[in-house]
């Protein structure tokens, strides 16, 4: 909107706010068991891990902020089976970390998030 | 889990990860119009704003990370009514900013988020 109507500083603050809300990788915490699709008798300690995931707003309401590039981070977690038959096992869990994001019209057909090795 | 079974450094890393995923206020972006429940002929520029909202994990699956204290931040936004009858108006929109969070068993009865003044 024309700067003549409004204070330049106010417009600058609004614009900076808008830039910060744009679709980009953001640190978020994900629940490992639900992402892995594990049965209810298997759980992890800690149950959640911190990774970067795409989030934020797009210039059009119909677009969705989606990942375009992903790296996998290995997290050391305790895997616990109930009933407890053995000592909780320390396992490496590969978690998807979104490194690139884009506002896309539709969700991808195969969303991958976590790979157990 | 007993430290005797595992490397102290590994346990420390796991514990730090766990602390970072705990229920707490996290910077997030919210869509103003949908939070305000505005009709489609009223929209805001920018459409999204950055605020702190409760997020993260709880120790029990039955608990939800909810806000226990809230402050309201005033954001200067353009409110645009369509059909456009006048110049877009610069309005102060009060947006809920979560300042305290807790893992609670149920959602509160009255969730407040944005107040227009």
């Amino acid at each position: 909107f024309a700067a003549t109507f409004y204070d330049i500083e106010t417009l600058k603050v609004i614009d900076e706010e808008w830039q910060r809300t744009q679709c980009s990788p953001r640190e978020t915490c994900v629940e490992v068991a639900s992402e892995l699709g594990k049965s209810t008798n298997t759980f992890f300690k800690p149950p959640c891990v911190n990774v970067f995931r795409c989030g934020g707003c797009c210039n059009e309401e119909s677009l969705i902020c989606m990942n375009t590039s992903t790296s996998y981070i290995s997290k050391q977690l305790f895997e616990i089976s109930v009933p407890l038959t053995s000592v909780p096992e320390l396992v490496p869990v590969k978690v998807a970390n979104h490194t690139g994001c884009k506002c896309l019209p539709t969700a991808p057909r195969h969303p991958y998030s976590i790979i157990r090795r | 889990f007993a430290a005797t079974f595992y490397d102290i450094e590994t346990l420390k890393v796991i514990d730090e990860e766990w602390q970072r995923t705990q229920c707490s206020p996290r910077e997030t972006c919210v869509e103003v119009a949908s939070e305000l429940g505005k009709s489609t002929n009223t929209f805001f520029k920018p459409p999204c704003v950055n605020v702190f909202r409760c997020g993260g994990c709880c120790n029990e699956e039955s608990l939800i990370c909810m806000n226990t204290s809230t402050s309201y931040i005033s954001k200067q936004l353009f409110e645009i009514s369509v059909p456009l009858t006048s110049v877009p108006e610069l309005v102060p929109v009060k947006v809920a900013n979560h300042t305290g969070c807790k893992c609670l068993p149920t959602a509160p009865r009255h969730p407040y988020s944005i107040i227009r003044r």
Epitope: A2, W18, N59, P105, T106 | P47
Partner: antibody, heavy 118, light 112 residues
């Protein structure tokens, strides 16, 4: 007020490339996607794709993929559309159009007529 | 691609009389977010297109209230309650739910 000013008419030979420009004013350039739409003489509208000026992300109509490139210069609030390997059926008026948050193409340039002839 | 089919392709109307244009899409235009991104554009002779209606029924700025839009799913209608001389031109429906964005083939509104 919002204005989209497009470059003048161009005549090109088959096989050549054309680059049309669209200078925006009266709004925050990076806050809106810019669409490119073409219209052959006496025909309807055809969507070519769009660019997000905030980060340069593009989405193209598959029909033009490999032949079209959309770019922006945020310093001058200008959007560009380059079409390569021109054919006679690329003769059309090429419009830039700003797209609102709600998806409608709310402001249009006056168009750039591109004539492809040998 | 989503095919947008408009009817009629030509509509001769008497000044002051109502006019109606239909637009049918080959797939539902309801987005996963619940919104329907169906828009109507007007193109007067020698002019660029102009947005009339966005998201099925919302009139854009400066558009007279004699223009109205309705419909849902795959069937949509643009109505002009009383046609005026300045309404002459081609009307297009367009969708922005799916990529590629597509347009109807256009309906030419002319005065009898």
């Amino acid at each position: 007020q919002v204005q989209l000013v497009q470059s003048g008419a161009k005549v090109k030979q088959p096989g050549a490339s054309v680059k049309a420009s669209c200078k925006a004013s009266g709004y925050t350039f990076t806050g809106y996607n810019m669409y490119w739409v073409r219209q052959a003489p006496g025909q309807g509208l055809e969507w070519m794709g769009y660019i997000d000026p905030y980060n340069g992300d593009t989405t193209y109509n598959q029909k033009f993929k490999g032949r079209v490139t959309m770019t922006t210069d945020t310093n001058t609030s200008t959007a560009y559309m380059e079409l390569r390997s021109l054919r006679s059926d690329d003769t059309a008026v090429y419009y830039c159009a700003r797209t609102s948050y709600y998806g409608g193409m709310d402001y249009w340039g006056r168009g750039t007529l591109v004539t492809v002839a040998s | 691609d989503i095919v947008m089919t408009q009817t009629p392709l030509s509509s001769p109307v008497t000044l002051g009389q109502p006019a109606s244009i239909s637009c049918r899409s080959s797939q539902s235009l309801v987005h996963s977010n619940g919104n329907t991104y169906l828009h109507w554009l007007q193109q007067r002779p020698g002019q660029p297109p102009r947005l009339l209606i966005y998201k099925v029924s919302n009139r854009f700025s400066g558009v007279p209230d004699r223009f109205s839009g309705s419909g849902a799913g795959t069937d949509f209608t643009l109505k002009i309650s009383r046609v005026e001389a300045e309404d002459v031109g081609v009307y297009y429906c367009s969708q922005s739910t799916h990529v590629p964005r597509t347009f109807g083939q256009g309906t030419k509104l002319e005065i009898k």
